[in-house]
């Protein structure tokens, strides 16, 4: 059962796992949610009736029954983790805490103009978990405007105290706001020889990398595969760090794999969701339950639905015994990973999918798969929407992309002459324009947010957000696309597609069926040569064939240039402008979305 509200002046008795410090009950709830075992918590707020050493304590708790006895206690705030909830969860915390000093290891001290600058510094520093900033009014002259970057083993403060004229806050890495590089490569036959901060068991290097990503101290990892010569180290995932933030030594060793934390890419690839099945593999751990199940998929479902289950092993039925049902062992451990992994015993193992809701919805795999384009199939581009204007008659105006459950990203130039959002309708999950009838459901537009530097498409900033009047329920035919990570600026996308209902030649009509065309990206230098009269800025991205033939065209504006990278689709561009359509040496010009990620997040996350 999902309980989101906090219980004031209430303490849960017993069930303690560990105690951490958090600046608020709300953040205590987030920490509990991300902890592998925590189901309930009790937070102690600052209060004259409480011992100051207990202020800001966040006690993480577990219970076999998923609840604990309640006791009245002033200043105590209790609640449940969001593990029991089905909604999307984020660790992003943009709050600034006034007059609080969050203690940790102060490893960097520098002058900053503002708390915001200090927070940005923390976000772009690989080690930083949180910061404290002494304001201009701080009594000690030599400490004024000092920005202290801090880290701890747990990622949360070791203590929190009241201190006048300082502010504290957390790194915004989990808000996708870091400019740190996103290195997705896994290096085979490589061992990173740096200090281990922790070690866990993992079935493969990908799971090891994802565990490293959401471990607060892990910057890179080494994984020993099941073929590793030393038996006791097989399937061992070593979580590592270094002072520089990079591995100091790389040793060539067969059957080992190494890689980096994906913390700078976590909004565009799954980092919590381990969805694979591991055949002929047994996960050992504390047994929670043994249930009969028809298949390993059914066993995974049972584990996902049991809130305390972290991983499972399924043993298929022997011959016709037990109505063809096998045994499903639901398991857990102190850290969410198996205590041991065994091979060759015939089991099929995997993890709960409950953690998938901590990943961005946009990372969900979709069905496999304009000018010179071909017709799409239903559900192939579930983020693509058709934006209609109803004045004076209803018709398709532009494309757009779902990027959140209340947000469409599109082009600013689509709103030339549009005096009110009332005349706009957003249709999602549409393949053919002919599906749209008078009674077809649509999303009304509450607000049009145009970039305030936009003047005209050809000079850039051709980007706009539509805030919908109601939220989109994600399904196979309507779901969001990931924004590119800022750490992905150097990624070379090779699988890019433009989609839309636009014209197939310069003078044509809106197409009935959503068209798609695979189009290669063109460097900005090359693009600039083709548009000498224009300034192709770094905030634009171009795509097209030298010989022409395939391109976006009129009616495709605002729609996506979608690129697939590491099995996840990213919204790399927004269809904007170009000379003619599909002309030789005239690439299409798109808004370069990665350059607007901050703007998008600022607008969509505004309170």
């Amino acid at each position: 059962e999902c309980v989101t509200q906090l219980l004031k002046d209430t303490c849960f008795e017993g069930g303690d796992i560990t105690t951490v410090f958090t600046p608020s009950a709300k953040y205590c709830q987030v920490v509990c949610t991300y902890h592998p075992r925590c189901l309930l918590f009790t937070f102690t707020a600052e209060s004259p009736s409480e011992d100051p050493t207990r202020w800001f304590t966040c006690v993480l708790k577990d219970s076999v029954t998923e609840t604990l006895p309640r006791v009245n206690r002033t200043a105590a705030i209790s609640g449940y983790s969001f593990k029991q909830c089905s909604h999307q969860i984020s660790a992003c915390n943009k709050d600034i805490y006034v007059d609080l000093d969050m203690k940790g290891i102060n490893y960097n001290s520098s002058v900053a103009k503002s708390a915001q600058e200090c927070q940005e510094r923390c976000t772009d520093d690989v080690h930083c978990h949180f910061f404290t900033y002494a304001t201009r009014q701080f009594p000690s002259l030599e400490h004024r405007n000092i920005c202290l970057l801090k880290h701890t083993q747990t990622g949360t403060p070791t203590r929190i105290t009241k201190l006048d004229k300082v502010v504290s806050g957390f790194s915004l890495k989990s808000c996708a706001l870091s400019n740190l590089a996103c290195i997705r490569d896994i290096f085979p036959n490589t061992v990173f020889a740096d200090s281990n901060i922790d070690s866990v068991m993992a079935p493969d290097a990908f799971v090891c990398g994802r565990i490293c990503t959401h471990h607060p101290g892990c910057l890179f990892f080494t994984f020993f595969s099941q073929e590793w010569p030393k038996e006791s180290q097989r399937n061992l995932c070593l979580l590592k760090t270094s002072e520089s933030g990079l591995p100091s030594t790389r040793i060539k060793k067969s059957k080992a794999l190494s890689g980096f934390s994906l913390q700078s890419c976590r909004h565009s690839i799954p980092v919590f969701c381990h969805s694979s099945f591991y055949h002929d593999t047994d996960f050992l751990g504390e047994e929670l339950d043994i249930v009969a199940a028809k298949s390993h998929e059914a066993c995974q479902k049972l584990c996902t639905n049991a809130v305390r289950c972290q991983f499972f092993t399924y043993t298929p039925a022997q011959a016709s015994c037990n109505e063809g049902k096998g045994k499903c062992y639901l398991k857990l451990s102190s850290n969410g990973s198996p205590t041991k992994i065994l091979h060759g015993r015939g089991g099929i193992s995997g993890y709960t999918l409950r953690l998938c809701k901590m990943d961005n919805e946009c990372t969900t795999k979709i069905k496999p798969r304009i000018v010179g384009g071909t017709a799409s199939v239903r559900g192939e581009w579930p983020w693509q929407v058709t934006l209609h204007t109803t004045s004076p008659t209803q018709r398709h105006l532009c494309g757009g992309s779902i990027i959140g459950n209340q947000w469409i990203l599109t082009a600013a130039h689509c709103f030339y002459g549009v005096e009110s959002p009332k005349i706009l309708r957003v249709y999602s999950g549409i393949l053919n324009q002919s599906e749209i009838k008078e009674d077809t459901s649509f999303f009304g537009v509450q607000e049009i947010i145009i970039h305030d530097q936009y003047k005209m498409a050809e000079s850039g900033y051709d980007i706009a957000l539509l805030k919908l009047e109601t939220t989109v329920n994600y399904t196979d035919s309507q779901r969001p696309i990931c924004l590119p990570s800022k750490g992905d600026r150097n990624v070379i996308y090779t699988d890019c597609w433009v989609t839309g209902w636009g014209y197939r030649k310069l003078r044509d009509k809106i197409q009935n069926t959503l068209q798609k065309a695979k189009i290669p990206l063109v460097t900005n230098e090359e693009c600039q040569k083709r548009y000498r009269g224009h300034k192709i800025t770094h905030k634009m991205i171009c795509a097209g064939y030298r010989e022409g033939g395939k391109d976006a065209c009129k009616g495709d504006s605002g729609g996506p240039l979608s690129c697939k990278h590491n099995e996840v689709w990213h919204l790399v561009g927004i269809t904007s402008w170009g000379e003619g359509c599909a002309q030789r040496e005239r690439p299409g010009v798109y808004t370069n979305v990665v350059e607007y990620v901050d703007w998008i997040l600022e607008k969509t996350q505004a309170v």
Partner: antibody, heavy 124, light 107 residues
């Protein structure tokens, strides 16, 4: 202020040539398609020619094809119309106009800015 | 070429009255149609683009409608300065064509 200023009109004999210019200011010239439209005395508007933003594509009315050449110099923000083999029926006020064509929404934006016109008289 | 035919050639109305001007294309021009106003001795001025969208600075009394082959320009309540010649123009074909114009005169 967005402005188009035509020049180069005048009196010319049949068979003669004339080069009209249109100086653009107050906007990014290279972003717009440009065109020439003429109006004979007491008559309606007649489209003459259009040119794409880069100058790579040109179109002409049948009545002037082979005799007139449209061109542009984006570095000088200027549109030209070279008129050869002029005839009496080419006598008109010649307007230059801009047209927004590079954006990829399906709307036709029309000729939203016009010059004041320059008069061409073809007479012996 | 796509022919554009405007009717009537002349329309006599009084200030405050409603004016309805018609334009017909010889084949579909989708919504690639614009309307222009030309006052005596002046350059044309864009009124309506894309068949039905009012250009910047054009009063709300001007409205356009239609799509395909039949288009209408409506002036809901004539003002003295509205008496002028009105042209429709298509750009669906790369050979642009104008209608012959409708002269709106004071009755």
């Amino acid at each position: 202020e967005v402005q188009l200023l035509e020049s180069g009109g005048g009196l010319v004999q049949p068979g003669g040539s004339l080069r009209l210019s249109c100086a653009a200011s107050g906007f990014t010239f290279s972003t717009y398609s440009m065109g020439w439209v003429r109006q004979a005395p007491g008559k309606g508007l007649e489209w003459v020619s259009s040119i794409s933003p880069s100058g790579g594509d040109t179109d002409y009315a049948d009545s002037v094809k082979g005799r007139f050449t449209i061109s542009r110099d984006n570095s000088k923000n200027t549109l030209y119309l070279q008129m050869n083999s002029l005839r009496a029926e080419d006598t008109a006020v010649y307007y230059c106009a801009r047209e927004r064509t590079m954006v990829r929404d399906p709307r036709y934006y029309g000729m939203d800015v016009w010059g004041q016109g320059t008069t061409v008289t073809v007479s012996s | 070429d796509i022919q554009m035919t405007q009717s009537p050639a002349t329309l006599s109305l009084s200030p405050g009255e409603r004016a309805t001007l018609s334009c017909r294309a010889s084949q579909s021009v989708s919504s690639y149609l614009a309307w222009y106003q030309q006052r005596l001795g002046q350059s044309p001025r864009l009124l309506i683009y894309d068949a039905s969208s009012r250009a910047t600075g054009i009063p709300a009394r001007f409205s356009g409608s239609g799509s395909g082959t039949d288009f209408t320009l409506t002036i809901s309540s004539l003002q003295p300065k509205d008496f002028a010649t009105y042209y429709c123009q298509q750009s669906y074909s790369n050979l642009v064509t104008f209608g012959q114009g409708t002269r709106l005169e004071i009755k």
